[in-house]
């Protein structure tokens, strides 16, 4: 039995997967900030987690996925205000009793040190210094991401 949050996450991810292939993104759009091979958009307004998820989807992006501790730190360095929290694309899966990224993968327990409980209707936010479990209904800001397409140099075999 999936929670409404899980279902929302799955529905949006599936609808994103169904969309036609678009040309790769070479530069970040206006108002988006580049962080390595990603473009990040930090919202100014606040919303519950599911609305934030849906908003990123309308922007042909997703809530932020963080690969590892290093990416977390680099993202946190972009947050200007100490006390501000931002939703990312990670929430608690009641059916699997584990933290689950919106792309379907599970959290590697070493990646993020989460403050707070792992329980139903919990979603993950980040601040300048920490990672928090919050009620998904809490209205805070959020971070959307778009992947940049790497420009590959052609490698020719030795002649």
């Amino acid at each position: 039995q999936k929670s409404s949050i899980e279902k929302c996450s799955v529905d949006i991810q599936q609808s994103r997967n169904k969309t036609t292939e678009r040309p790769g993104l070479l530069n970040c759009p206006i108002y988006w900030q580049q962080l390595r091979e990603k473009c990040l958009l930090f919202s100014h307004t606040v919303n519950p987690w599911n609305n934030s998820l849906a908003d990123c989807s309308t922007k042909e992006s997703s809530l932020l996925l963080i690969r590892d501790k290093d990416e977390l730190i680099h993202t946190q360095n972009l947050i200007r205000d100490k006390a501000i929290l931002f939703w990312i694309g990670l929430n608690f899966s009641l059916s699997e009793k584990n933290w689950k990224w919106i792309n379907g993968s599970f959290l590697n327990s070493n990646d993020l040190e989460i403050r707070g409980d792992a329980k139903e209707n919990s979603c993950i936010s980040i601040s300048q210094t920490s990672v928090y479990s919050e009620y998904c209904s809490t209205e805070i800001r959020w971070i959307c991401q778009k992947e940049l397409t790497p420009v590959r140099n052609k490698v020719y075999p030795d002649s």
Epitope: I30, Y31, L41, F42, S43, H44, T45, V46, N47, N51, A54, D55, T58, K59, E60, R80, D81
Partner: antibody, heavy 117, light 110 residues
């Protein structure tokens, strides 16, 4: 180049509902938020509210009880309804693109709405 | 949620610098780095000049700059030109997804 165009009646009777539509051209409505701002003659700007393309709305607390906004992404349009209008609602009404929720980078040319019997 | 306070008028001669202030509270200007400034010529729609306190959209001359200290934001126009004569409005995010504008300042180029 993104362009916004307000349309709707220029004259509304007191106690009736003011209705305006903003048509967005030169870009998709889906990736941004959209706001309504008004300006009485010779006075300052007042933010009325914003709508997200997912349908969520935020309204100015002073107008919240009378305002309704909606969006039609298929037509690249969003709309404003302001109920129970009085002469104090007479103003130029602007629609604007609200990229992140705190500023407006593209504006319509404005639509003068007069409330009078 | 009251309007931000701006001086009703400001003036300067061509080539001079003029600074327009915008005073709010810790709930709006002081609490967020989300102050913007707009220029409005008579009969025209406002035009974004500064956003997020000090960022300039493309196409806006670098004569326009923004800053903030405490609960007061400022717009400075250096090297005043005749076409800078207009009304200027500040705006700030005010928490809970609300926005508030200033009352406007009429800038006269002498």
């Amino acid at each position: 180049q993104v362009q916004l165009q307000e349309s709707g009646p220029g004259l509304v009777k007191p106690s009736e509902t003011l209705s305006l539509t903003c048509t967005v051209s030169g870009g998709s409505i889906s990736s941004y938020y959209w706001s309504w701002i008004r300006q009485p003659a010779g006075k300052g700007l007042e933010w009325i509210g914003r709508i997200y393309t997912i349908g969520t709305t935020n309204y100015n607390p002073s107008l919240k009880s009378r305002v309704t906004m909606s969006v039609d992404t298929s037509k690249n349009q969003f709309s404003l309804k302001l109920s129970s209008v009085t002469a104090a609602d007479t103003a130029v009404y602007y629609c604007a693109r609200d990229p992140l929720g705190s500023f407006f980078d593209y504006w319509g040319q404005g639509s003068l709405v007069t409330v009078s019997s | 949620q009251s309007a931000l306070t701006q001086p009703p008028s400001a003036s300067g001669s061509p080539g001079q610098s003029v600074t327009i202030s915008c005073t709010g509270t810790s709930s709006d200007v002081g609490g967020y780095n989300y102050v913007s400034w707009y220029q409005q010529h008579p009969g025209k729609a406002p035009k974004l000049m500064i956003y997020e306190v000090s960022k300039r959209p493309s196409g806006v001359p670098d004569r326009f700059s923004g800053s903030k200290s405490g609960n007061t934001a400022s717009l400075t126009v250096s090297g005043l030109q005749a076409e800078d004569e207009a009304d200027y409005y500040c705006s700030s995010y005010a928490g809970s997804n609300n926005l508030v504008f200033g009352g406007g300042t009429k800038l006269t180029v002498l």
